[in-house]
Interface confidence: low
């Protein structure tokens, strides 16, 4: 499809002149930020951003790539180097330490410097690094964590936890030796390390005693509580604050977010990770956009401002499964949440960052015609005279041989939410990729997000913009609309 | 390998504080640009940038990813949307039209709006769009084109040519009907469309009559001239300017670049594309860095400034072959040329952009240890209990089945310059990829390079920065060190 208006050079010249005009008008917002929001697209490398743009554009009945995402409207962009101290290609634990605490760590460790060693409990103490969220709380701001994964998962845990093993969700996931040495599971750290005002996501089963039935799936033993210490961490958390409320479904979330007596809110909507957006039951589970809105409603009551972490955490899971349909629909939902946050906040007093922790070995190639489905087939056939998809993976479970040959694929197969795009190398799980990811920035001090930076720089920009430790002497004018 | 200094949080905190300090000090250079340089890494997507960074770092005996490339030092970054009007994933012709002329076109067409149709000669006239290089020449600047491909190849041709078929290198590549309709081959356009001061790269055989022996390979008939019109285009070009010089080897290039009587220089160092850097004979052929230096030496004599296009054109070719070793060594050489240009010019009066036309389905995954060779094996085995490489392709000639199964690979195989990384789908040639590419900018008006932009915006930034058409009323102070 060739759009007729795009055939005219004036279309492009006019568009570029407008973009130049906007670029010339762009003025850094030189005040401090009252509020900090970081949107983290887990596994959202640049190839995922572009493919999600096309998908979202096509959902809006456009051709696709010309239609900007919400994140595309952010005025400043940088590239972030994601390697961990010990690996060229990192995981979500080491990266969370970087962008949330400002220090790079080792693979599979969270909230610890690289002096800590994976799985060695006795290397924890003394190597803790403090998150920007923790520093924001100490400065009197309200703070929140929102994710589509378990709230104890690697990315959100970077905001509050310190652990040598990202898999220590509850004490049942820990070796006895680590428990005896005094290491704490992530769920325990969630409620005890610091005061978090809003906690929304999945992860119910790590909060309750072994065998405690789940409210949503009471007859499914695999969804029961997992805790060996017999504790009810939700109860313990509720007891800490008079205005604390726990919810486990969408209706309760909506009610709680509108209730002025609620000062602290924990919503855990699944035993483990939340469902993919395409599988979500909208009567039971909130979307990422709805959770983001609920969090902002509560947090924005604080005159001192807030820190909010919002994760589209299952973009990553879709890619790990070699299922681009899942990854990209999650990415579109993530962008919807960014869009909603933009409507509910002001760029005059809120620094919003959008970034990824790492990329995936996911590519969008061949030479598909403009307007063709992002999940569609490439034009023409491969060398083996079979069809192939534009989207492919470098490695992963999409690798299949049928009778010693690569399987054929049809347009209808490739468009299925269950379809796994093919891969070059068979792995149980498709891997992350090591290339730089984008950081999009808007709001006070967003202009500091520039060039090519270490991923750990992201946390420092947030801390500096809000004059948090170690930048309390930031020398910035107070945020718009505040009196000091 | 875990570098001991990186175990200390101070290492990261200090580094980030320095980066913040630099970001705060960053002041836009608000004058006009006297000189424009665009470095084009053909096929250099973000995954190629990161992998090249690691390779270059390791060549310097570092661990790799921490070591900045020359382009990493550029203060401003944007993302560029590369789709062509008719394709989600573009080629080097349509993209050259975008970043060099400021208008998006159709796949395989050069210097024409999307009203033109591939291979239809009669859709050429009236649809020509004018390159920034052409506009710079009209404004009295000197102009140059440097590439490691043929100088008649798609990317450089975007600076001077208008053709409905990128493959029309010489008249021998054109159907008779197109010639009769008055369409001109690209080599003819190179010497006749506009006055280009410096032309350096490959492409000798398209300039000389059919059967004319090549000076470097006189006994290889496949390297003979190809022209059916019997013309000697080099001779015709030399006759246009008293100070014109033609060279075909490194020694002659060095002499000419130091000769003050040479005002125009054409250097064609191979019959077709130049050799890969790893195959280059340094006594006969110059490197991209040397060609860049020679071009700058000549062009910078003009008090009105210059426009220079420099292409690392064979990054793309390495990827098309599924040979990451070739792609990445070309990318490192490309970065060396950027570094050299930075030493020879001033950011006070020279706007330098570095970008790519498109990406490739090339990924850098698995979870390799820090410091391990970029060409090395992944830790562990695949599901089929065989080794696999960290670098892989989505599609391409790297797909091989041995006895109905994926072949194993050793560390020494994977490190060979000839090794083709495996791919998910067998194609004669690995394809481009459609994700956004980075634009790095330094110099006057570089701050306009921000956010997410259409690829065509790149040309407009250059035109505006140098106050060229259509931005002659740019309202910018004259470049540093000039008197108006």
């Amino acid at each position: 499809i060739i759009p007729v208006e795009e055939e005219n050079p004036d279309f492009w010249n006019r568009q570029a002149a407008e973009a130049l005009g906007a670029a010339k008008k762009l003025q850094p917002i030189q005040t401090a930020a009252k509020n900090l929001i970081i949107f983290l697209g887990d596994g959202m490398g640049v190839s995922t951003v572009t493919a999600a743009r096309i998908l979202k554009g096509q959902k809006e009945e456009k051709l696709g790539p010309e239609t900007p995402l919400a994140m595309d409207h952010f005025p400043y962009v940088a590239l972030s180097k994601t390697y961990s101290v010990d690996k060229h290609v990192p995981d979500s634990a080491a990266t969370a330490t970087a962008y949330l605490c400002g220090v790079k760590g080792n693979f599979q460790t969270i909230g610890l410097s690289a002096a800590a060693r994976y799985n060695q409990c006795n290397t924890t103490r003394g190597n803790e690094v403090v998150s920007v969220m923790n520093r924001a709380k100490k400065a009197g701001k309200s703070v929140g964590v929102v994710t589509t994964t378990r709230v104890q998962h690697a990315s959100p845990a970077g905001a509050y936890a310190h652990t040598v093993n990202r898999n220590w969700y509850s004490d049942a996931n820990m070796p006895g030796s680590a428990r005896r040495e005094g290491c704490k599971d992530i769920a325990t750290q969630l409620i005890s390390n610091m005061d978090i005002d809003v906690i929304l996501g999945g992860g119910r089963k790590y909060m309750f005693r072994m065998g405690a039935p789940d409210p949503e799936y009471p007859h499914d033993y695999s969804q029961d509580g997992t805790r060996m210490d017999g504790k009810n961490l939700v109860q313990e958390w509720l007891a800490k604050h008079q205005g604390a409320r726990y919810v486990w479904n969408r209706t309760e979330l909506m009610q709680a977010s509108l209730d002025p007596s609620v000062t602290h809110l924990m919503g855990l909507f699944e035993p483990g990770d939340m469902k993919y957006e395409i599988h979500r039951d909208p009567t039971l589970d909130p979307s990422l956009m709805e959770m983001t809105e609920a969090a902002l409603r509560l947090l924005s009551r604080n005159p001192r401002g807030f820190f909010l972490f919002v994760e589209g955490g299952r973009i990553d899971h879709g890619h790990h499964e070699s299922r681009a349909y899942r990854a990209l629909t999650e990415a579109v939902m993530f962008d919807d949440a960014i869009e909603r946050a933009g409507q509910l906040t002001s760029e005059e007093d809120t620094l919003t960052l959008v970034t990824a922790d790492h990329s995936h070995v996911f590519s969008f190639g061949a030479y598909p015609l403009r307007g063709s489905s992002i999940f569609g087939l490439a034009p023409g056939k491969a060398q083996d005279r079979k069809a192939y998809t534009a989207l492919l993976y470098g490695n992963g479970p999409g690798y299949v041989l049928k009778d010693g040959a690569r399987p054929d694929v049809t347009e209808s197969e490739s468009g299925s939410p269950e379809y796994r795009q093919q891969a070059a190398v068979p792995l149980d799980e498709e891997t992350h990729a090591g290339e730089d990811v984008a950081v999009f920035a808007r709001g006070p001090q967003a202009h500091l997000v520039h060039g090519v930076q270490e991923q750990s720089f992201v946390a420092h920009v947030m801390a500096f913009a809000a004059c948090l430790e170690p930048y309390t002497a930031c020398d910035l004018a107070p945020p718009a609309g505040t009196t000091d | 390998i875990i570098p001991v200094e990186e175990e200390n949080p101070d290492f990261w905190n200090r580094q980030a504080a320095e980066a913040l300090g630099a970001a705060k000090k960053l002041q836009p250079i608000q004058t006009a640009a006297k000189n424009l340089i665009i470095f084009l890494g053909d096929g250099m997507g973000v995954s190629t940038v990161t992998a090249a960074r690691i390779l270059k770092g390791q060549k310097e005996e570092k661990l790799g990813p921490e070591t900045p490339l020359a382009m990493d030092h550029f203060p401003y970054v944007a993302l560029s949307k590369t789709y062509s009007v008719d394709k989600h994933v573009p080629d080097s012709a349509a993209t050259a039209t975008a970043y060099l002329c400021g208008v998006k076109g159709n796949f395989q067409t050069i210097g024409l709006s999307a009203a033109a149709r591939y291979n239809q000669c009669n859709t050429t006239r009236g649809n020509e769009v004018v390159s920034v290089m052409n506009r710079a020449k009209k404004a009295g600047k000197s102009v140059g084109v440097v590439t490691t491909t043929r100088v008649q190849h798609a990317s450089p041709a975007g600076a001077y040519a208008h053709t409905v078929n990128r493959n029309w290198y010489s008249d021998a590549n054109m159907p008779g009907s197109a010639r009769r309709e008055g369409c001109k081959d690209i080599a003819t356009q190179l010497i006749s469309n506009m006055d280009i001061d410096v032309i350096l790269g490959g492409g000798r055989k398209y300039m000389f009559r059919m059967g004319a022996p090549d000076p470097e390979y006189p006994h290889d008939y496949s390297q003979d001239g190809t022209r059916m019109d019997g013309k000697n285009l080099v001779q015709e070009w030399l006759a246009k300017h008293q100070g014109a010089r033609y060279v075909w080897n490194r020694t002659e290039l060095m002499q000419a670049s130091l000769d003050p009587s040479v005002t125009h220089l054409m250097g064609l160092f191979e019959p077709g594309d130049m050799k890969y850097e790893i195959h280059r004979d340094p006594t006969l052929d110059p490197s991209l860095m040397e060609m860049t230096e020679a071009a700058l030496r000549l062009l910078s004599r003009n008090p009105r400034g210059f426009f220079l296009f420099v292409e690392g054109g064979r990054i793309d070719h390495g990827h098309h072959e599924s040979r990451a070793y070739r792609a990445l060594t070309e990318a490192v050489m490309f970065d060396d040329a950027i570094e050299r240009a930075g030493q020879l010019t001033s950011e006070e009066d020279t706007l330098t952009l570095v970008t790519a036309d498109h990406s490739h389905v090339f990924s850098f995954g698995a979870y390799p240890l820090r410091g391990s060779s970029i060409f090395g094996l992944a830790p562990g085995k695949a599901q089929d209990r065989k080794a696999y490489t960290a670098l892989l392709y989505g599609n391409g000639p790297g797909y091989v089945l041995k006895d109905g199964a994926r072949p194993d690979v050793t560390e020494s195989e994977s490190g060979s310059p000839e090794y083709r990384q495996q791919a998910a789908v067998p194609l004669d040639e690995e394809t481009h990829a459609g994700e956004d590419v980075a634009v790095f900018a330094r110099g006057p008006q570089a701050h306009l390079v921000h956010g997410v932009q259409e690829q065509s915006f790149v040309a407009h930034v250059m035109a505006f920065a140098a106050c060229l058409e259509p931005y002659t009323a740019c309202d910018l102070a004259p470049p540093a060190g000039t008197t108006d």
Partner: nanobody, 121 residues
């Protein structure tokens, strides 16, 4: 914790057939590889066949055409149908489950206790 329970081993004459099965229980991630290895007396443990949840199957050259691996994803069970058995197939057969580290907790490799197969006349 994941448990693997093998069954179906025994004594069989050359040319005969046996069917081994291995059931996995515990928190098993849906993306995984199940397979069979064998260890002959005094030798190292060798791959026999593996089947991934994605449908990829791989055999050792020595058993191609004689052994067939299959799996029932719903039951988390893998089977090995062994035909045309030879004396050199005599070994302890171990079931193996590999789960990815990335999205779940737990080790990478799980092994069964082994079931003995003897091919002798």
């Amino acid at each position: 914790q994941v448990q693997l329970v093998e069954s179906g081993g025994g004594l069989v004459q050359p040319g005969g057939s046996l069917r081994l099965s291995c059931a996995a229980s515990g928190s098993i991630f849906s993306v995984n590889t199940m397979g069979w290895y064998r260890q002959a007396p005094g030798k190292q443990r060798d791959l026999v066949a593996v089947a991934t949840s994605g449908g990829t199957i791989h055999y050792a050259d020595s058993v191609k055409g004689r052994f067939t691996i299959s799996r029932d994803n719903a039951k988390n069970t893998v089977y090995l149908q062994m035909n045309s058995l030879k004396p050199e197939d005599t070994a302890v057969y171990y079931c193996n489950l590999v789960v990815p580290y990335g999205m779940i907790a737990g080790d990478h490799d799980y092994w069964g206790q082994g079931t003995k197969v003897t091919v002798s006349s």
